[in-house]
């Protein structure tokens, strides 16, 4: 057959769907690979062809669009399952072609099972709510396009294994779940089950997301450097190891990049000749406030090194701060036998 632009297996689009539920899967060609949409392609005389390779098989085969009740169908650039079966798992390919043009891409589809607590191998999206921030909502995700607006589905919300009813601060409101005042106790997995009729049949869509309650922007502050500080002096003799921790607290800020770095005499450690290593550790509070510690280490410090300026810097979306460490050379202790004896007038 003639050459075809093969975009390979698009593993970035690892699509997971629940068994026995409808699934609508758009051909990724138009979303990620080509500069035109399906309508343009169709009006230019291009045809979209679907085929698949079953799990643990090498053989590409056409998709059977003649199953009872049109269980699998294609509509424009969407492949529909109404509903999926476990053995629909495999690699699916959509190919756009005419006599002179051909482009195709494959993607993996995994049909997964869930239990009655909605546990499954499905990768869950995370929705962050601000702690004690007033009313916030989550919306049942990825249900657009499954039924027309004239259809009024039923929506049932669950937290973990439990149907949400009579919860103190969590109220189901159709496709939305409202948190009157989010608390740490609201952390967990939330599931919406959307049930709707279509052509005399009834379908369920199950969507689970993880809610994580995080620090509120109302309480956010610029980075706080706990160490170095004015109370600790790093007093070393030449040849000793110099260890200076820079410990910085960052309030949680959505989409903020938290940065910590050292400068030595105003330069980044990479830009100077001394043998310095920096180790970083990060810890998080329950509300995702972050504490970063960068330990600056010089194995065998010289008297020159002890005269340098060591400054810890920190930056977040809330601002930038810096703090110099107090480093000095240790004054040698007096030698007892000679100096003290002289003091007593010994000859």
């Amino acid at each position: 057959s003639e050459r075809c632009d093969d975009w390979g297996l698009d593993t970035m689009r690892q699509i997971q769907v629940f068994e026995d539920e409808p699934a609508r899967i758009k051909c990724p060609l138009f979303e990620h690979f080509l500069k035109f949409n399906y309508s343009t392609a169709h009006s230019a005389g291009l045809t979209l062809i679907w085929y698949w390779t079953r799990q643990d098989r090498d053989l590409e085969e056409p998709i059977n669009f003649r199953l009872p009740e049109n269980r699998i169908s294609k509509e424009k650039d969407v492949l529909w399952f109404r509903p999926t079966l476990l053995n629909d798992t495999g690699n699916y390919t959509c190919m756009l072609r005419n006599t002179t043009y051909c482009s195709k891409v494959a993607f993996p589809l995994e049909v997964v099972q869930k239990d009655s607590c909605f546990n499954s191998p499905m990768k869950l999206p995370v929705h962050k709510l601000y702690i004690e921030y007033g009313i916030q909502r989550i919306t049942c995700p990825n249900v657009d396009g499954y039924f027309p607006s004239s259809v009024k589905p039923t929506i049932t919300w669950y937290m973990g294994c439990y149907k949400i009813q009579n919860f103190n601060n969590v109220i189901p409101e159709g496709m939305n779940l409202s948190f009157l005042i989010a608390l740490i106790s609201n952390n967990g997995n939330y599931t919406c089950v959307v049930t709707y009729p279509e052509n005399g049949r009834t379908f369920h869509l199950t969507r689970t997301l993880t809610v994580k309650v995080v620090g509120s922007p109302k309480n956010a502050v610029p980075p706080v450097i706990h160490s170095p500080n004015d109370h600790v002096v790093y007093e070393k003799e030449p040849g000793e190891e110099l260890l200076i921790p820079c410990t910085v607290y960052f309030s949680f800020l959505m989409d903020s990049r938290n940065e910590v770095w050292w400068t030595i005499d105003g330069k980044k450690p990479d830009d100077i000749t001394i043998d310095v290593t920096i180790n970083e550790s990060i810890s998080h509070s329950r509300t995702e406030d972050e504490t970063r510690t960068q330990i600056l280490s010089i194995k065998k410090v010289t008297s020159e090194d002890l005269k340098r300026s060591y400054v810890c810097h920190a930056r977040s979306a809330k601002g930038e701060v810096a703090k110099a460490a107090k480093v000095k050379q240790k004054v040698p202790a007096p030698r007892y036998t000679v100096e003290l004896a002289c003091g007593f007038g010994a000859t």
């Epitope: 099972q113 546990n119 039923t154 009813q165 049930t195």
Partner: antibody, heavy 117, light 107 residues
Framework: EVQLVQSGAEVKKPGSSVKVSCKAS????????IHWVRQAPGQGLEWMGY????????EYNQKFTDRVTITADKSTSTAYMELSSLRSEDTAVYYC??????????WGQGTLVTVSS | AIQMTQSPSSLSASVGDRVTITCKAS??????VSWFQQKPGKSPKLLIY???NRYTGVPSRFSGSGSATDFTLTISSLQPEDFATYHC?????????FGGGTKVEIK
């Protein structure tokens, strides 16, 4: 094909207990909740409670809280409803029903429990 | 517990008649009402869920409407196989509760 097959009719003495079983087939047992509903002769339906087979958690109608126990055995795909301290007004047909997303779509055939001295 | 009051408790009708059964909840239950059909000696069968959605395979002559506290089941043209008892139930909050049932008999 989804099926819920219940145990046979029982005649019990007042004060005794009854345990009704509901064997599920045609689907993954621990993907759905099982509810129990009863119907006294010539009366309406009365919800007794449910069991979540994954967590083992059961929720009961307070009217029965001290007398009813709903359990599930995942290894045999069977749900159970045990009612103790039986009285004559417990004479009813007991149904198990599979629920998902608030839909009671599949029901067992019912088990008649007669309480008589 | 939420009370579900169903009326009438029984009615007589002929094939082809339009039949309406109502159910009143003692509290707001949103759209969380289901309707079931039950024939003598048989288990209930789901007809309507979410107040107005027909379950799989249910004929279009059955329709449901209402929200909050007032709900209606309508059979637009009664068929011989429709003579049965109909139950409404609120699936909104535990304990789930049902109406007393409406028996539809042949006139």
């Amino acid at each position: 094909e989804v099926q819920l097959v219940q145990s046979g009719a029982e005649v019990k003495k007042p004060g005794s207990s009854v345990k009704v079983s509901c064997k599920a087939s045609g689907y993954t047992f621990n993907s759905y909740w099982i509810h129990w509903v009863r119907q006294a002769p010539g009366q309406g339906l009365e919800w007794m409670g449910y069991n979540n087979p994954t967590s083992g958690y059961s929720e009961y109608n307070q009217k029965f809280t001290d007398r009813v126990t709903i359990t599930a055995d995942k290894s045999t795909s069977t749900a159970y409803m045990e009612l103790s301290s039986l009285r004559s007004e417990d004479t009813a047909v007991y149904y198990c029903a599979r629920e998902y997303g608030d839909l009671f779509a599949y029901w067992g055939q019912g088990t008649l429990v007669t309480v008589s001295s | 517990a939420i009370q579900m009051t169903q009326s009438p408790s029984s009615l007589s009708a002929s094939v082809g008649d339009r039949v309406t059964i109502t159910c009143k909840a003692s509290e707001n239950v949103g759209y969380s009402v289901s309707w079931f059909q039950q024939k003598p000696g048989k288990s209930p069968k789901l007809l309507i869920y979410g107040a107005s959605n027909r379950y799989t395979g249910v004929p279009s002559r059955f329709s449901g409407s209402g929200s909050a506290t007032d709900f209606t089941l309508t059979i637009s043209s009664l068929q011989p196989e429709d003579f049965a008892t109909y139950h409404c139930g609120q699936i909104y909050i535990y304990p789930y509760t049902f109406g007393g049932g409406t028996k539809v008999e042949i006139k």
